[in-house]
C-alpha cells in the first residue's frame, strides 16, 4: 500500500492489498477501503460505471460481469484501485462490439478477459480467414486488444478475440472494424461553369462538386470581399468506401446588377484547403458589340476578291444576322459561326465573301444583327477601281 510523509493526505488503503484479484464465478467479492475521509467506491468495466458509498464493497455471488477495476476515493480526491477478475469458463470475454479506428491511429478491440490465466489471447479473422499480414496488435487482458496503426485496407475487417483452451480456440463474438480515413490530400473541387453572364431578374445557379475520402470535409460558398452567408443546397453520395462526393448548389433566384462579382467554393479538411471560383456578371439588359476585323473603308481592284469580316459579342445569343447591299439581303456568300464551342461563348464571327468584284459593285455593305434585346449594325464602304 502507498506510504507518504506524515501530515500529507494519503491515498486510501484497500484490503486485499494487491493490484489484481482473481475470484471464481459464484464466489464472494469482499473489498474493504480504509480511510478516515472515505467518499466512495467506483467500479468500471468497458463503458459501465457503478458507485457505492459503503466503505466495504460486497458482491455475494460474483459473475463474469463483475470483472473490472474497483477504485476507492477519499475526500482529498486521492484514490487506490484493485482489479478483480471473475473467472467464468462459460464467459471468457466481456465485449463492447463497437469498433471504429482512425486510419494510422491505434484502436482498441474491447474484449477484456474474465480470466488472465489463458494462452494465446489474440485476434483471429472470421471464418478462419487470416488477418492482414501487416496487422499488429498489443494484448491487455484488462482492456482488450489494441490494433496498431489502422490501415484503410482493414475497413470492414471481421475479427474475433481468441484464447486457446484445451487445445482449441475459444472465440468472442465477432467485431467489424470500421475505418475512418485520414485526409492525405486536399479536397478536389470543381465548378459547373467558370463564368456566368445574366440579365437582371434571371436565376443564377452554380454547382460546386467537392470530392474527398469522407463526409467530414468542410465546404462553403463565399462571395469575395463579403461576409454575407449564401444560401446553398447540398446533395451527397458515397461511391464506395473512401470516395465521397458532395454537390453544393448556390442559387440567386432573381439576380441583380450588384450581385455581379466573384464567388468562391472553398473546401477544407485536416490536410489543407482548396478553392475554385466562378464569375457572375449581371447586366441590366442584353447587348451587341460589333468589331470590324478589317478597315470599314475598302479599296479593291476590278475582278479581285474581298472578305468582309466582323466579330461581335452578343448577349443573349443572336437571333437574326444578315448582310445587305443596295437594300437586298445576301442569301449565300456569307457564313456566321461562334468564335468558340465553349458553353459560355458570347463572341461570334460573320464573314461575307465577295468574289471577282466589278466596278458596278462598289458601295455600302451592311452587317445587321439582333437578339431579343437589341439590334446593331456596321457598314463597310467598298470602292472598286
Amino acid at each position: 500500500q502507498p506510504s507518504v510523509s506524515p501530515g500529507e493526505p494519503s491515498p486510501p488503503s484497500i484490503h486485499p492489498g494487491k493490484s489484481d484479484l482473481i475470484v471464481r464465478v459464484g464466489d464472494e467479492i469482499r473489498l474493504l477501503c480504509t480511510d478516515p475521509g472515505f467518499v466512495k467506491w467506483t467500479f468500471e468495466i468497458l463503458d459501465e460505471t457503478n458507485e457505492n458509498k459503503q466503505n466495504e464493497w460486497i458482491t455475494e455471488k460474483a459473475e463474469a460481469t463483475n470483472t473490472g477495476k474497483y477504485t476507492c476515493t477519499n475526500k482529498h480526491g486521492l484514490s487506490n484501485s484493485i482489479y478483480v477478475f471473475v473467472r467464468d469458463p462459460a464467459k471468457l470475454f466481456l465485449v463492447d462490439r463497437s469498433l471504429y479506428g482512425k486510419e494510422d491511429n491505434d484502436t482498441l478491440v474491447r474484449c477484456p478477459l474474465t480470466d488472465p490465466e489463458v494462452t494465446n489471447y489474440s485476434l483471429k479473422g472470421c471464418q478462419g480467414k487470416p488477418l492482414p499480414k501487416d496487422l499488429r496488435f498489443i494484448p491487455d487482458p484488462k482492456a482488450g486488444i489494441m490494433i496498431k496503426s489502422v490501415k484503410r485496407a482493414y475497413h470492414r475487417l471481421c475479427l474475433h478475440c481468441s484464447v486457446d483452451q484445451e487445445g482449441k480456440s475459444v472465440l468472442s463474438e465477432k467485431f467489424i472494424l470500421k475505418v475512418r480515413p485520414a485526409f492525405k490530400a486536399v479536397p478536389v473541387v470543381s465548378v459547373s461553369k467558370a463564368s456566368y453572364l445574366l440579365r437582371e431578374g434571371e436565376e443564377f445557379t452554380v454547382t460546386c462538386t467537392i470530392k474527398d475520402v469522407s463526409s467530414s470535409v468542410y465546404s462553403t460558398w463565399k462571395r469575395e470581399n463579403s461576409q454575407t452567408k449564401l444560401q446553398e443546397k447540398y446533395n451527397s453520395w458515397h461511391h464506395g468506401d473512401f470516395n465521397y462526393e458532395r454537390q453544393a448548389t448556390l442559387t440567386i433566384s432573381s439576380a441583380r446588377v450588384n450581385d455581379s462579382g466573384v464567388f468562391m467554393c472553398y473546401a477544407n479538411n485536416t490536410f489543407g484547403s482548396a478553392n475554385v471560383t466562378t464569375t457572375l456578371e449581371v447586366v441590366d439588359k442584353g447587348f451587341i458589340n460589333i468589331f470590324p476585323m478589317i478597315n470599314t473603308t475598302v479599296f479593291v481592284n476590278d475582278g479581285e476578291n474581298v472578305d468582309l469580316i466582323v466579330e461581335y459579342e452578343a448577349f443573349p445569343k443572336p437571333e437574326h444576322q444578315q448582310w445587305i447591299y443596295m437594300n437586298r439581303t445576301f442569301t449565300d456568300k456569307w457564313e456566321d459561326y461562334p468564335k468558340s464551342e465553349n458553353e459560355s461563348n458570347i463572341r461570334y464571327v460573320s464573314e461575307l465573301h465577295l468574289t471577282r468584284l466589278k466596278g458596278t459593285e462598289g458601295g455600302t455593305y451592311t452587317f445587321l444583327v439582333s437578339n431579343s434585346d437589341v439590334n446593331a449594325a456596321i457598314a463597310f464602304n467598298v470602292y472598286v477601281n
Epitope: E117, V118, P130, L135, P139
Partner: nanobody
Framework: QVQLVESGGGLVQAGGSLRLSCVAS????????MGWFRQGPGKEREFAAA????????YYADSVKGRFTISRDNAKDTVYLQMNSLKPEDTANYYC?????????????????????WGQGTQVTVSS
C-alpha cells in the same frame, strides 16, 4: 537499459527435458513482457513463447504448444522456459527477449520487430 542473460542450454536426448532461465537487470522487470525466440541451423529466427507482464497470460508457437511452458518470477527478475518432450527439430540457439509493449501478429506470434532487448542466446542441441 535492460541486460538479459540466458542459461540452461545444453545437449539432451530426444524426449528429454531442459529448463532455460533468463535473468534481467537494469530496469523494472515486472513492467516488461518476456519471451523466447529460437534460431535453428540455417533457419530464420522464430518465436517460441511469451508471457505478459501480469505473469499469467502466455503465448506459444504452434510448434511448441503442449510441450513448452513459460513462467516468470518477478521477485527474481527471471523468466523460465520449461522444455519437455524435446525433438531434434528443437535444436537451436534460444534467445531471451523483453518488450514494454509487445506487438503480436496473426496466430499470436510475437513480432520480433517490437522486441526492445535481446539476450546473447543459449544453445540447445537435441540428439536423436
Amino acid at each position: 537499459q535492460v541486460q538479459l542473460v540466458e542459461s540452461g542450454g545444453g545437449l539432451v536426448q530426444a524426449g528429454g527435458s531442459l529448463r532455460l532461465s533468463c535473468v534481467a537487470s537494469g530496469r523494472t522487470f515486472s513492467s516488461y513482457a518476456m519471451g523466447w525466440f529460437r534460431q535453428g541451423p540455417g533457419k530464420e529466427r522464430e518465436f517460441a513463447a511469451a508471457i505478459l507482464s501480469n505473469g499469467l497470460t502466455t503465448y506459444y508457437a504452434d510448434s511448441v504448444k503442449g510441450r513448452f511452458t513459460i513462467s516468470r518470477d518477478n521477485a527474481k527478475d527471471t523468466v523460465y522456459l520449461q522444455m519437455n518432450s524435446l525433438k531434434p527439430e528443437d535444436t537451436a540457439n534460444y534467445y531471451c527477449a523483453a518488450a514494454f509493449t509487445p506487438e503480436f501478429r496473426d496466430g499470436g506470434i510475437w513480432d520480433d520487430a517490437s522486441v526492445d532487448y535481446w539476450g546473447q542466446g543459449t544453445q540447445v542441441t537435441v540428439s536423436s
